[in-house]
Interface confidence: low
């Protein structure tokens, strides 16, 4: 069963539970999740994930029991985990994935839980002991039984059968808003220094919410929506409203790159790189975020917020949600996908527009023309063969269609005349007493990537022309330069003469005119998605990937592109990760995408990088990435003590020890070193990879990465008996690059 971050199931419990045999199998990527609550006025059993660890709380009368899984085993890894909790004959046992994790004696009293069982969340239950519990589950319960009875039946409409695809969707999978009340909630969008929200939007909705973030002060918010087919952004602060419109239409079913940028001075919305921004009036100031960032829809509170607002957003508009999809979502530069959402409603993994599906049905039989190679146009299905009425002139004997169609060939980005040979009559017009000016063409469906331009007064608006116009070269096709190698026009052809002829010619026949696009090689060019300045800490290395620079080439795949680093190769700071010390003067686009390259700073002023990229035929103009090396600044973020029993071991986690640096978008190596002797124990590090069972060995140096991975611990080895608590003072120094912070 799939739970989406705001749903739950309830199961009645009529009598007290004397024995408990609870079995759950769940998977989630969220570190917080309420799995199950058996609730009474005071007695209760709670199973939840907190910081990725399973916690069990059992309260029986005046007694409270807590069990939890070890810190080093995180269960929020999207993998199914099986939990078994048994309470039998005064003994509670918890095991996860077949391993015994904890057990303890419990009072023999039965568990009085008349409020019932709550699976996946607590609903509207408001009991004092629920304060501070985890968020509702966003993930899957593959199985849940209590004393042999399934807790997942019956399912409610909000809890779906099976395990939804969206929980395992990587962040390159689009967020599909399938309506009518779609919504995705993400962690709050902080805009303290500046905030950016970026995504690619595809929709035909002319009116729909896109993003809403409430502020800490009552009434403050940031709201981005589609209003009359265009993007609009509203920022409401205590000192007034900032309203911004963008002129690029977005409700056309085509993908549009959207970027919203806000800082203390201005607000900017950009669609397909066309920006609109407020003047630097400085009215915005900082909006302290409250609650979640809502995308594609609004919850009841946000709707209320907007309805109270003087913009006069109507209830209908605020209740509606986006119908369409968001791809490549990033919030403050961090990629976000369905997996990171805190809750979702009526969402789909991937982009499937209902309009598109409808179109596919309606034009299914045309589809072959747009996908087959141009030399192999199939026998025309269109027009439908015409059966002439009896008694017509002999010229119409065996007549089925008026025209023989041949593909129009155009260069990518070029123009081509529509000529007689493309729309050649199958019969002798003079013999049929028809004039070319009486054969009327009307464009019923335009090409996807170009325009038929008519050099005839008034014809462009009517999209109509005659065979005489074709002969006189009055109709030409102008291609828009896109990369598809085929396209098509749908033409309706009718005859306006008052002579005897088949009635189908008066009514009109529909023809498909295939368009074959001959590609032109576009030179690639280099783009810097986050600007052409890169900051690196002195004496460190920084990955060079597509987030730093990338190639744009509309007609070459990444496989066909090669980068060159220009300038002298000696001392070149670009290297492959697996060939350290070897300058990489040339590398492939694939290597760049795979994260194989690093910039290594070895001292002195940082060397700027000038690149060019080639598709094998043409090279881009050189592009320079300016690189600035800054001295590392190290700041202690956390340095708390540990309390542990003599003779035991305790992990040192980021909550106990972590530092922050001034690295910008750089995952730097932070080295801790022990500078003084330990009296009562030793610092230990787990073997590489932190694999289960890897040995712990004494160390006097470790990296912050080791701390983050739970691979550092303090082991008390002092065998002596003390009448007091002993205190080990761990003297550390921290090194980043060649910068050292001592006496930590």
């Amino acid at each position: 069963a799939s739970f989406f971050g705001e749903n739950h199931l309830e199961v009645p419990v009529a009598t007290a539970l004397t024995d408990i045999d609870l079995q759950l199998q769940f998977s989630t990527s969220q570190p917080e999740a309420l799995l199950l609550l058996a609730a009474g006025p005071a007695d209760h059993l709670l199973l939840q994930l907190y910081s990725g660890r399973l916690q069990v709380r059992l309260v029986l009368g005046q007694e409270e029991l807590r069990l939890q899984t070890p810190a080093e085993t995180l269960l929020s890894d999207s993998i199914p985990h099986t939990v078994v909790l048994t309470v039998v004959e005064g003994w509670a046992t918890l095991s996860v994935d077949g391993f015994l994790n904890a057990s303890s004696a419990v009072p023999g009293a039965p568990l009085e839980v008349p409020y019932g069982l709550f699976v996946g969340g607590t609903g509207t239950l408001g009991l004092p002991y629920l304060r501070g519990t985890s968020r509702p589950l966003r993930g899957c319960l593959h199985a849940a039984t209590l004393n042999g009875r399934s807790l997942l039946r019956p399912l409610t409409p909000d809890v779906h059968e099976g395990c939804a695809e969206e929980f395992s969707a990587s962040d390159d999978v689009a967020l599909g808003f399938s309506g009518p009340h779609s919504l995705a909630a993400f962690p709050a969008w902080g805009t303290q220094d500046e905030g950016t929200l970026e995504f690619t939007l595809t929709t035909q909705s002319r009116q729909a919410p896109l993003a809403f973030q409430a502020g800490g002060r009552r009434g403050d918010f940031i709201y981005v929506d589609i209003f009359e087919g265009h993007l609009r952004a509203v920022v409401e602060k205590g000192q007034g409203t900032v309203l911004l419109h963008n002129s690029v239409p977005v409700a056309d079913g085509q993908p549009h790159e959207v970027s919203v940028h806000i800082n203390a001075h201005r607000l900017e919305i950009s669609v397909d790189q066309y920006p609109t921004h407020t003047s630097n009036r400085g009215v915005l100031s900082y909006l302290e975020p409250r609650g979640s960032l809502l995308l594609g829809g609004l919850d009841a509170e946000a709707s209320r917020h907007l309805q109270e607002h003087r913009l006069g957003l109507t209830p209908e508009a605020t209740n509606a949600s986006l119908l369409g999809c968001m791809e490549d979502l990033s919030v403050n530069g961090q990629r976000r996908g369905l997996r990171e959402a805190l809750l979702t409603r009526n969402m789909a993994a991937g982009c499937r527009l209902e309009e598109e599906e409808y179109e596919d049905d309606a034009y299914g039989h045309y589809e072959a023309f747009s996908t087959l190679a141009p030399e192999a146009w199939p026998a025309m299905e269109l027009p439908e063969p015409c059966v002439p009425e009896p008694g017509l002139p002999p010229v119409f004997a065996n007549f089925t269609q008026l025209l023989t169609i041949s593909p129009l060939v155009v260069a990518e980005g070029g123009t081509a005349w529509l000529e007689w040979r493309h729309v050649q009559p199958t019969l002798d017009l003079m013999e049929a007493e028809l004039r070319k000016s009486q054969v009327l063409f009307s464009v019923t469906r335009g090409a996807r990537h170009g325009e038929l331009e008519l050099d005839i007064p008034g014809a462009q608006a009517r999209k109509m022309f005659t065979l005489l116009d074709v002969v006189n070269r009055k109709a030409r096709f102008i291609h828009d330069g896109s990369e598809d190698t085929s396209d098509q026009l749908v033409l309706e052809v009718s005859v306006t003469a008052r002579v005897p002829m088949p009635s189908c010619l008066r009514r009109g026949q529909t023809y498909l005119l295939p368009i074959q696009v001959n590609p032109v090689n576009d030179p690639p060019h280099i783009i810097f998605p986050h600007g052409s300045l890169m900051v690196i800490l002195e004496h460190t290395q920084k990955p060079l990937g597509p987030e730093v620079f990338q190639a744009y080439d509309p007609d070459s795949a990444c496989e066909g592109l090669t980068f060159q680093v220009l300038g002298t190769s000696s001392g070149l700071p670009v290297e492959r990760r697996d060939q350290p010390g070897e300058p990489a003067t040339e590398f492939s686009c694939r290597e760049l995408e795979a994260g194989s390259l690093v910039y290594v700073h070895r001292g002195g002023p940082a060397q700027d990088l000038t690149f060019r990229v080639s598709d094998g035929l043409q090279a881009s103009p050189p592009a320079t990435l300016k690189v600035v090396a800054i001295r590392p600044a190290i700041q202690i973020h956390r340095s708390t003590g540990l309390r542990l029993a003599q003779g035991s071991a305790m992990p040192i986690l980021p909550a106990n020890l972590s530092v922050e640096t001034n690295a910008v978008g750089q995952d730097v190596s932070v080295l801790f070193r022990v500078t003084g002797a330990l009296q009562f124990g030793e610092l230990q590090k787990q073997g590489a990879g932190g694999v289960e069972g890897a040995e712990w060995w004494a160390t006097q140096a470790f990296h912050q990465r080791d701390v983050e991975q739970g691979r550092v611990r303090y082991l008390s080895t002092d065998p002596q008996h003390h009448a007091y608590d002993t205190v080990e003072n761990l003297a550390l120094e921290v090194q980043v690059g060649q910068e050292i912070l001592s006496n930590l």
């Epitope: 070193r673 002797a677 124990g681 006097q700 065998p719």
Partner: antibody
Framework: EVQLVQSGGGLVQPGGSLKLSCAVS????????MNWVRQAPGKGLEWVGE??????????YYAESVKGRFTISRDDSKNTAYLQMNSLKTEDTAVYYC?????????????WGQGTLVTVSS | DIQLTQSPSFLSASVGDRVTITCKAS??????VAWYQQKPGKAPKPLLF???YRYTGVPSRFSGSGSGTDFTLTISSLQPEDFATYFC?????????FGGGTKVEIK
């Protein structure tokens, strides 16, 4: 100035015993883990073993090739580390270095003795 | 045990050359690698630790990189005093092990 001064090397017959000493000055000996590393003539370096601090219960680790035959000990009052070598084999012929790590951490050796040659030959 | 394979075993170079020595571990050792320089008849001297951190007093022409299984020691511009044998060492797990060494000779 940190100094590790070694003594006790020499010629010994196979099956014999020898005790090497390493006297330390210039740092607080009792805070440093002491190690022994050896180098056969014209060959590479081989770690022999280590001894930790009193707070680590003087924990010892050894290379498989010497386990059961060699014993590392320390006397913090004399600032000296020892390598007791028993049941010596011809392949134990090497220059033996005592090394330490403490201040500049990681299990790599920041201070080295001058080395002492042990020759096992009949 | 973790084996460390150094290459090349011998290297002829001239003063001013850029020299690269590689060290390959038989399994993942993270960045727990140190490099030493040894001259004939002398004890080894530490150069780098944690794959890329220079030991106090080591000239900046010595640099190191790598993580996992592949490591490199680079001397950006060889000086007369750099002709020596270089060893890598892993301290990711016991037993601690060394590479076979790379002798840098004058061309």
């Amino acid at each position: 100035e940190v100094q590790l001064v070694q003594s006790g090397g020499g010629l010994v017959q196979p099956g014999g015993s020898l005790k090497l000493s390493c006297a330390v000055s210039g740092f607080t000996f009792s805070n440093y883990w002491m190690n022994w590393v050896r180098q056969a003539p014209g060959k590479g370096l081989e770690w022999v073993g280590e001894i930790r601090l009193k707070s680590n219960n003087f924990g010892r680790y050894y290379a498989e090739s010497v386990k059961g035959r060699f014993t590392i000990s320390r006397d913090d009052s004399k600032n000296t580390a020892y390598l007791q070598m028993n049941s010596l084999k011809t392949e134990d012929t090497a220059v033996y270095y005592c090394t330490s790590y403490g201040n500049y951490v990681g299990h790599y050796f920041d201070h080295w003795g001058q080395g002492t040659l042990v020759t096992v030959s009949s | 045990d973790i084996q460390l394979t150094q290459s090349p075993s011998f290297l002829s170079a001239s003063v001013g050359d850029r020299v690269t020595i590689t060290c390959k571990a038989s399994q993942n050792v993270d960045t727990n690698v140190a490099w030493y320089q040894q001259k004939p008849g002398k004890a080894p001297k530490p150069l780098l630790f944690s794959a890329s951190y220079r030991y106090t007093g080591v000239p900046s022409r010595f640099s190191g990189s790598g993580s996992g299984t592949d490591f490199t020691l680079t001397i950006s511009s060889l000086q007369p005093e750099d002709f020596a044998t270089y060893f890598c060492q892993q301290y990711n797990s016991y037993p601690l092990t060394f590479g076979g060494g790379t002798k840098v000779e004058i061309k």
